[in-house]
Amino acid sequence: LPAQVAFTPYAPEPGGTCRLREYYDQTAQMCCSKCPPGQHAKVFCTKTSDTVCDSCEDSTYTQLWNWVPECLSCGSRCSSDQVETQACTREQNRICTCRPGWYCALSKQEGCRLCAQLRKCRPGFGVARPGTETSDVVCKPCAPGTFSNTTSSTDICRPHQICHVVAIPGNASMDAVCTSTSPTRSMAPGAVHLPQPVSTRSQHTQPTPAPSTAPGTSFLLPVGPSPPAEGSTGD
């Protein structure tokens, strides 16, 4: 004959254990029902009556099957440098993570206790290792032939642009400035366009500056009718 299904509460077999989602109550010496997530034990079981469960109150939660007398309090509201990635419900705690541009300097079991702003690499330095959720940006000096002209937590050192004729050589914090070998229609004859107009982003009706120049910015330097002489400042 099949063994009878025991209904809680029941006395376990000697040396036996309670079933899944049950617990052994020391006072009653019985296997009793646990409460589901989102609830807690309002009344503990006795030899003749099972656990009585009740819903968690606002701002409290239980995440697991349990027999706790009171639900756990949700964590405090997220600070200004954090975003709430999981709201406080009856079944889960609030989780705060660092907002974009910040990283977790001190973590807790879930989410972050203390956020810190990602380091910004200053001009002449680029990002060697990007920031992650739990680690800061690592900066490095731009190597010869590369530059960064921004203060940024994301920009890497970029190569200097190739010039036919260099007007101003690049350095760690500035791109090379090129002279134009063939002025386009929108430029005055005998002008030097800084930087090189068409080695970069295309726009044929007017010269376009290199990416390191602010959009819509172009520089015209008047020079004599002959091409610029090669001097100490550049080619």
């Epitope: 032939g145 004729v165 063939s182 386009t184 080695s199 982003r201 080619d235």
Partner: antibody, heavy 120, light 112 residues
Framework: EVQLLESGGGLVQPGGSLRLSCAAS????????MHWVRQAPGKGLEWVSA????????YYADSVKGRFTISRDNSKNTLYLQMNSLRAEDTAVYYC?????????????WGQGTLVTVSS | QSVLTQPPSASGTPGQRVTISCTGS?????????VHWYQQLPGTAPKLLIY???QRPSGVPDRFSGSKSGTSASLAISGLRSEDEADYYC???????????FGGGTKLTVLG
């Protein structure tokens, strides 16, 4: 008429050196950036190095940085590529190319190429 | 692996129109940099076919045209001829690299 003529290729052992030359004519050599581009047998094109018109600034692909040196002699209208510490993967046809008018990032004229074979 | 992506091969019959694509990223084509195309006939040096996205050097037939949109570009060849059988390469400047970058090349076969 623009002409670019490479020379100096040949067979060299790994670790060895070679110097390529490119004789240019038909344009104002010193006004243009010049490039070296290579093509391994049966493979695609790979940019290797460039030099500005006045030879003040040089540019290299990461794969050759520290081993190759680009230079030019504007009085002789000649471009050079000194290749040291050569490796088997440097085996390729090496082309010299002229930077495009107004834009050094394209090549409006190419030489016929010179073959460099690195093998023991 | 090339920075710019091209189909390894393409084919068409004489008179047909074929297009070859070239896909890049936000650091090259998508950054607004011009795309250039080169033709390499068997056993010869590459030759400039299209520059600055859609400009043809003198001597290049108007059967060849180029276009660019977003992070990709394409080369179109109309009225295909047997002498168009060649390798075609796209190229562009890239923010993170010192020199221009190339596509892996597309081998165009003219059938029949």
């Amino acid at each position: 008429e623009v002409q670019l003529l490479e020379s100096g290729g040949g067979l060299v052992q790994p670790g060895g050196s070679l110097r390529l030359s490119c004789a240019a004519s038909g344009f104002t050599f010193s006004s243009y950036a010049m490039h070296w581009v290579r093509q391994a047998p049966g493979k695609g094109l790979e940019w290797v190095s460039a030099i500005s018109g006045g030879a003040t600034t040089t540019y290299y692909a990461d794969s050759v940085k520290g081993r190759f040196t680009i230079s030019r002699d504007n009085s002789k209208n000649t471009l050079y590529l000194q290749m040291n510490s050569l490796r088997a993967e440097d085996t390729a046809v090496y082309y010299c190319a002229k930077g495009g008018t107004g834009d050094p990032y394209y090549f409006d004229y190419w030489g016929q190429g010179t073959l460099v074979t690195v093998s023991s | 692996q090339s920075v710019l992506t091209q189909p390894p091969s393409a084919s068409g019959t004489p008179g047909q129109r074929v297009t070859i694509s070239c896909t890049g990223s936000s650091s090259n084509i998508g950054a607004g940099y011009d795309v250039h195309w080169y033709q390499q006939l068997p056993g010869t040096a590459p030759k400039l076919l299209i520059y600055r996205n859609n400009q043809r050097p003198s001597g290049v037939p108007d059967r060849f045209s180029g276009s660019k949109s977003g992070t990709s570009a394409s080369l179109a060849i109309s009225g295909l001829r047997s002498e168009d059988e060649a390798d075609y390469y796209c190229a562009a400047r890239d923010d993170g690299l010192s020199g221009p970058v190339f596509g892996g090349g597309t081998k165009l076969t003219v059938l029949g």
